[in-house]
Structure formats: structure tokens, C-alpha cells
């Protein structure tokens, strides 16, 4: 039987979302809790690490929102953006894989507002290379499991 | 040669949209014609059954539209959303994989108004679990079978 | 070991974008720069070829912006659509496999404005056809190639 | 340590305009918004609206839009709160709060009024 | 519009009382909700912020409970510089005040 491809979905833990509203690497998510898991991939620091060289489909979910029960927006104008990021170990540097978001208007009369980001993409990725989430606005992230996740599995081997 | 992996891609009946604005279960799909297909899943009551324990990417592309050519919005503030949901049949219980949505405000001058979630993601799914897709505000579902779609394929099996 | 399973990942050539507000088909994409990749399918003409029958797991992800340095938009209202466009040369045609994008008002005191589509499906593809990306103001693109891209991969045979 | 001063008592006829100053020291006045509420005699506190020090972002009570103008000057960390139209129902103590909330840190502006300012009476006879 | 409401709208207890004051909302606010005392004369002070949570140099006599659409302010021993009135706020809105005094 062949070994198990690697893969890994990985949900926002709800508890270490940072604030702010500038862009920020989200740095914890779980593996091993509900929707959450891993294969053959490494989780660190937030970053999930490649452990066998292949060609993988990433993907990332991210939601936003806000009610107003939790206050005010400070400013109506928002960039909801979404980044997935590589980076190198060996030669330290990082590179946009994928990128997605919106501009949003969140002023008005509507007393709730969401948003949500998809994005995804077949890539090749080396042992060692890290693959990273980052987002603007944190602080309005949605902590859902099934709202706020992004993951990878391998489809094929590099010839 | 290996047994053919599991996999469907279901396209809305355009016939059976509920009307409403409330959150529903779409229970009508398509899985032979146009670009609908399935292999080794079954369609039962609008849900996509499983048949063989693996790992599947499960994805969703949901369209709402409005035209002012067919009436009035009954409110200029619109939550549109997906819920891709899996249900166990032996232990009766729902639980939501993935969201996505927006919230709206379709009011002002233009005539067309348009928007499309994309979801997508990796998930362990037992033999008899069910997929199924919720969406508010059906009545605003663009029912092209380009546009209003769901589907799942087996990446590999459960070591 | 089993023959690589044909992919691509496509990024916008962004010398080559064309300018209007009209729909068009994206004619120039990268297939050997950065992230962009090509194996067992062929690019001509801004189509993705299909070399070999099989069933292909496809997608977009195209991002919309502006910035009022570069001037006013003509018009606050705007359609950003993505066509994912399947073509038959045996049989001249094409059908729209997929499709996504928003209604957006891009007038209002905001500078800067963004918005990202993501589509994906899961289509029978045959030796021969081809696929294309067809899109709604393309004056208007972001020519990252973390923004706007397309791509398949082969996941399984037809039987 | 934090203070919000306040400018002293006024009074106004029916009509009149008047403009309340909230002087902020101890803090980074850019990175936090500023609240008006007022106390009219025998009732409730009442909100009136709020200032993003940093952007100049305003919002205001229904009950007040149209009458009240708050600004900023950065420079001289200070807000501003100007009522128009006076009627003797706006005879009240009026006071500055300071939002919790440190927009470096993020955007939502709590209501958790952490600092207050003296407040500052404004009486409306004819 | 939410609409929050105190109870008692006065109340009068001996030093050393535990003491209890209770705010509704007119719907769910999850947990944000402040409570603040307010004496003539003075600016008013933050207690309690997110239901429970108590302000720095509060004194820890004071604790703040509940969720949804019901609150409560306790003072576990009521001490002489406790006497003022007492606000819950959620937002925008205000209790309309409970009175404490000393009898």
C-alpha cells in the first residue's frame, strides 16, 4: 500500500488571535481538534512545514466580521486581505503564494457585518519550506472552524 | 488498474429553488447532465452521500443575483451565505465544515446586482456521512449550472 | 513509478493585459516564471490544453484593484466577473464551466479599492479541449502573480 | 498618568452654541478615541458621540446628529464637543471619556470608558 | 435600540453588607457590559468592563457577573466611600442609575 500522502487542515485557535488592524502572521492553529488535522507535515510557530518534496494544492479560508454589540469601527474603510506566504528555512525569505480580500465599506445602518476570503492553488514545495497565513484587521477575524482554516495536500511527487 | 476514486460535481436544479430568505438546505441537484457527474457517492434528498471512508476535498461556488427588472428587494441589507454541512446519519447530528458569505447592501441606483462565494476544503468523511449545502436567501441563487455548484473527490484513502 | 499527472499554474502576463471595461478572454499567462508551471498540458494562445482525457480539478483566482492615482473610473458601478471557459475544437464551441465575481460601487472617499474572486471544480476534461479565463474590466487587474492565476491538475483517469 | 481637563462651566441662552475642551496628557492621544456623554439633572448618563483622535473619525447619537460637531487638534491633544441650537433640556454636566481601546492595537472602539474628565456644566436660560 | 435597565433603582445597606445590583438588557449582548460608579461632583470611574472583568485599582470588593441580557454588580462588603450611584452601560446605553446609601 503507498505511503500516505501528507496533508493537513489546519482551524484558528479562537484564543491567540492577535489584535490590530495592521497585517499580521497568524501564529496558532490547531491540528488535532475537530475539523482539525495533520499528515505527514509539521506544525510550528503557527507555520506548517513541508517534510517531503511535491506538487500540493493550498488553500485558505478567512472570515470576518463584526456586531455591533462588540462596539464601533474606528474606521469605516477596511482592507480584509488575505496572504499565503512560503518561506524558505535555508535561504531565509519569504514569498506570496497567493493573495485575496476586499475593500469593504462596514459603515451604515446594518447593525452585523461578514466577509469571507477563498483562495487556492497547486504549487511545488521542498522539504523544510514553511507555508504561512497572513491577514489584515485580526481583530475581526471569525473563530469558527469552519470560517477561519487553511490547509495543503500533496497530489503529486516531483519527477 | 485501481479502483476509481469516488467523486461528484452537482449542479443546481434551477426547478426546485426554494423562495424565502431564511437559511435552507438546498435538496435539489443535479448529477447527469450538463457538467453534473458522480462515481461512487450517491445523491439522496439533496445530499451527497458517502460510500467509501477516504479523504475528499469538498468544495462550493454558490452565485446570488438580483435584477430590479424582477421587483423590489424586501430589505437592502442582505446576509448571503453558504454553509457546506455533514451530517452522520448514525449518530443523528449536523456540523458545518465551511462558510462563506458576505453581508450586502444592495440598495442604490444599479439595476444588477451580483456576488459568488467559493469554498473549498480537506476533510476525513466516513462511509454514510451525508454533505449537504445551506444557503440563505435562495430565492437570490443564480441557478446556471456554472454558477451554483457543489462537489467532492476522493484524494486518498484512510490509512 | 506511474507518468506525472499533467498540471498547470498559470500567471498573468501583465504586460499583456488588455485595457476597456468589456468582457475578454486573458490571452498571455506565464507558464516558467515564478510560480507559474505547465507539465502534460500545453499553453497556446492564452488557452490551457488538455493532452491528456482525464478528470482535472480546475480554478482561478482573480483580483480586481484601483487606486485613484491612476485617475477616476469612468463609472462607480461595476461588474468583476471571471469566465472559466471550456472550448472544443473538435466541435467549435465554448461553455462557461465556471463563474464568480460581485456587483461593487467603487465611488465613495476611499482611495484604494480590491476585491479577489476564487472559482473551483471538479470537470471531465478530453485530449484536445482547452480552457480559458475570460473576465469583466480588465483594465482593472491586479498583475501580481499572487493575484491573478488559473490552474488544473489531473486527479483521476476516465475509466 | 492619564488625565482628561476639562474647560470650566458656561452658560447659554436658548439658541446659542456653545463648545466644550477636553485637554488629554499621560497617553499618546492619537491612539485612542474620545467619547462625549452628558448628565442632564435627575437622569441618566446619556451618549452623544465619539472621536478617532487618530483619523478624525466621528459618530454620533441619532438624537444629536445635525447639532453636535466633536474635532481634534493632535497637536494640542484636544478634543472638541460643539452643541448647536441650545435648548434648556441641554442643561447638563458634560464629560469626556477616553475608549479603552488602543486603535495600534485594534479597531474596534470598545465603549469601555476607561478615564474620564471632570465634566463641565452647561446651563441653557433665557 | 437596546435598552438597559437597573434594579433596585435605590437601595440602602449597613457596612460590612454584601451588595447586589442587577442590569438588563432588552436583548442578548453576549458580555459587554460595563459597570461604573458615579459620585456628585467627581468624574465617574470605570469598574467592571466584559461583564466581569475588573478595572486596575478597583478594589477587588467589587466583581461583576452574567452573560446574555442579564448582569449583576456585587460589592462583597459595603465600605463608607462606596456610597454613590451605580451605571451599567452597554455601548451606547446606559442603566438609569441604582442609588446606594448607607443606613
Known amino acids: 500500500k503507498p505511503e500516505a500522502q501528507p496533508f493537513a487542515h489546519l482551524t484558528i485557535n479562537a484564543a491567540s488571535i492577535p489584535s490590530g488592524s495592521h497585517k499580521v502572521t497568524l501564529s496558532s492553529w490547531y491540528h488535532d481538534r475537530g475539523w482539525a488535522k495533520i499528515s505527514n507535515m509539521t506544525l510550528s510557530n503557527g507555520k506548517l512545514r513541508v517534510n517531503q518534496d511535491g506538487f500540493y494544492y493550498l488553500y485558505a479560508n478567512i472570515c470576518f466580521r463584526h456586531h455591533e454589540t462588540s462596539g464601533d469601527l474606528a474606521t469605516e474603510y477596511l482592507q480584509l486581505m488575505v496572504y499565503v506566504v512560503k518561506t524558505s528555512i535555508k535561504i531565509p525569505s519569504s514569498h506570496n503564494l497567493m493573495k485575496g480580500g476586499s475593500t469593504k465599506n462596514w459603515s451604515g445602518n446594518s447593525e452585523f457585518h461578514f466577509y469571507s476570503i477563498n483562495v487556492g492553488g497547486f504549487f511545488k514545495l521542498r522539504a523544510g519550506e514553511e507555508i504561512s497565513i497572513q491577514v489584515s484587521n485580526p481583530s475581526l477575524l471569525d473563530p469558527d472552524q469552519d470560517a477561519t482554516y487553511f490547509g495543503a495536500f500533496k497530489v503529486q511527487d516531483i519527477d | 488498474k485501481p479502483e476509481a476514486q469516488p467523486f461528484a460535481h452537482l449542479t443546481i436544479n434551477a426547478a426546485s429553488i426554494p423562495s424565502g430568505s431564511h437559511k435552507v438546505t438546498l435538496s435539489s441537484w443535479y448529477h447527469d447532465r450538463g457538467w453534473a457527474k458522480i462515481s461512487n457517492m450517491t445523491l439522496s434528498n439533496g445530499k451527497l452521500r458517502v460510500n467509501q471512508d477516504g479523504f475528499y476535498y469538498l468544495y462550493a461556488n454558490i452565485c446570488f443575483r438580483h435584477h430590479e427588472t424582477s421587483g423590489d428587494l424586501a430589505t437592502e441589507y442582505l446576509q448571503l451565505m453558504v454553509y457546506v454541512v455533514k451530517t452522520s446519519i448514525k449518530i443523528p447530528s449536523s456540523h458545518n465544515l465551511m462558510k462563506g458569505g458576505s453581508t450586502k447592501n444592495w440598495s442604490g441606483n444599479s439595476e444588477f446586482h451580483f456576488y459568488s462565494i467559493n469554498v473549498g476544503g480537506f476533510f476525513k468523511l466516513r462511509a454514510g456521512e451525508e454533505i449537504s449545502i445551506q444557503v440563505s436567501n435562495p430565492s437570490l441563487l443564480d441557478p446556471d449550472q456554472d454558477a451554483t455548484y457543489f462537489g467532492a473527490f476522493k484524494v486518498q484513502d484512510i490509512d | 513509478k506511474p507518468e506525472a499527472q499533467p498540471f498547470a499554474h498559470l500567471t498573468i502576463n501583465a504586460a499583456s493585459i488588455p485595457s476597456g471595461s468589456h468582457k475578454v478572454t486573458l490571452s498571455s499567462w506565464y507558464h516558467d516564471r515564478g510560480w507559474a508551471k505547465i507539465s502534460n498540458m500545453t499553453l497556446s494562445n492564452g488557452k490551457l490544453r488538455v493532452n491528456q482525457d482525464g478528470f482535472y480539478y480546475l480554478y482561478a483566482n482573480i483580483c480586481f484593484r484601483h487606486h485613484e492615482t491612476s485617475g477616476d473610473l469612468a463609472t462607480e458601478y461595476l461588474q468583476l466577473m471571471v469566465y472559466v471557459v471550456k472550448t472544443s475544437i473538435k466541435i467549435p464551441s465554448s461553455h462557461n464551466l465556471m463563474k464568480g465575481g460581485s456587483t461593487k460601487n467603487w465611488s465613495g472617499n476611499s482611495e484604494f479599492h480590491f476585491y479577489s474572486i476564487n472559482v473551483g471544480g471538479f470537470f471531465k476534461l478530453r485530449a484536445g479541449e482547452e480552457i480559458s479565463i475570460q473576465v469583466s474590466n480588465p483594465s482593472l487587474l491586479d498583475p501580481d502573480q499572487d493575484a491573478t492565476y488559473f490552474g488544473a491538475f489531473k486527479v483521476q483517469d476516465i475509466d | 498618568q492619564v488625565q482628561l481637563v476639562q474647560s470650566g462651566a458656561e452658560v447659554r441662552k436658548p439658541g446659542a452654541s456653545v463648545k466644550v475642551s477636553c485637554k488629554a496628557s499621560?497617553?499618546?492621544?492619537?491612539?485612542?478615541?474620545i467619547h462625549w456623554v452628558r448628565q442632564a439633572p435627575g437622569q441618566r448618563l446619556e451618549w452623544m458621540g465619539w472621536?478617532?483622535?487618530?483619523?478624525?473619525?466621528?459618530k454620533f447619537s441619532q438624537k444629536f446628529q445635525g447639532r453636535i460637531t466633536v474635532t481634534r487638534d493632535t497637536a494640542a491633544s484636544t478634543a472638541y464637543m460643539e452643541l448647536r441650537s441650545l435648548r434648556s433640556e441641554d442643561t447638563a454636566v458634560y464629560y469626556c471619556?477616553?475608549?479603552?481601546?488602543?486603535?495600534?492595537?485594534?479597531?474596534?472602539?470598545?465603549?469601555?470608558?476607561?478615564?474620564w474628565g471632570q465634566g463641565t456644566l452647561v446651563t441653557v436660560s433665557s | 435600540e437596546i435598552v438597559m435597565t437597573q434594579s433596585p433603582s435605590s437601595l440602602s445597606a449597613s457596612v460590612g453588607d454584601r451588595v447586589t445590583i442587577t442590569c438588563r438588557a432588552s436583548q442578548s449582548i453576549s458580555r459587554y457590559l460595563n459597570w461604573y460608579q458615579l459620585k456628585p461632583g467627581k468624574a465617574p470611574r470605570l469598574l467592571i468592563y466584559g461583564a466581569s472583568s475588573l478595572q486596575s485599582g478597583v478594589p477587588s470588593r467589587f466583581s461583576g457577573s452574567g452573560s446574555g441580557a442579564e448582569f449583576t454588580l456585587t460589592i462583597s462588603s459595603l465600605q463608607p466611600e462606596d456610597i454613590a450611584t451605580y451605571y451599567c452601560q452597554h455601548t451606547r446605553a446606559f442603566g438609569q442609575g441604582t442609588k446606594v446609601e448607607i443606613k
Open positions: 471619556a477616553r475608549d479603552s481601546s488602543n486603535m495600534v492595537r485594534g479597531i474596534i472602539i470598545a465603549y469601555y470608558f476607561d478615564y
Open positions: 499621560g497617553y499618546d492621544f492619537s491612539n485612542y478615541a
Open positions: 472621536i478617532n483622535a487618530g483619523n478624525g473619525n466621528t
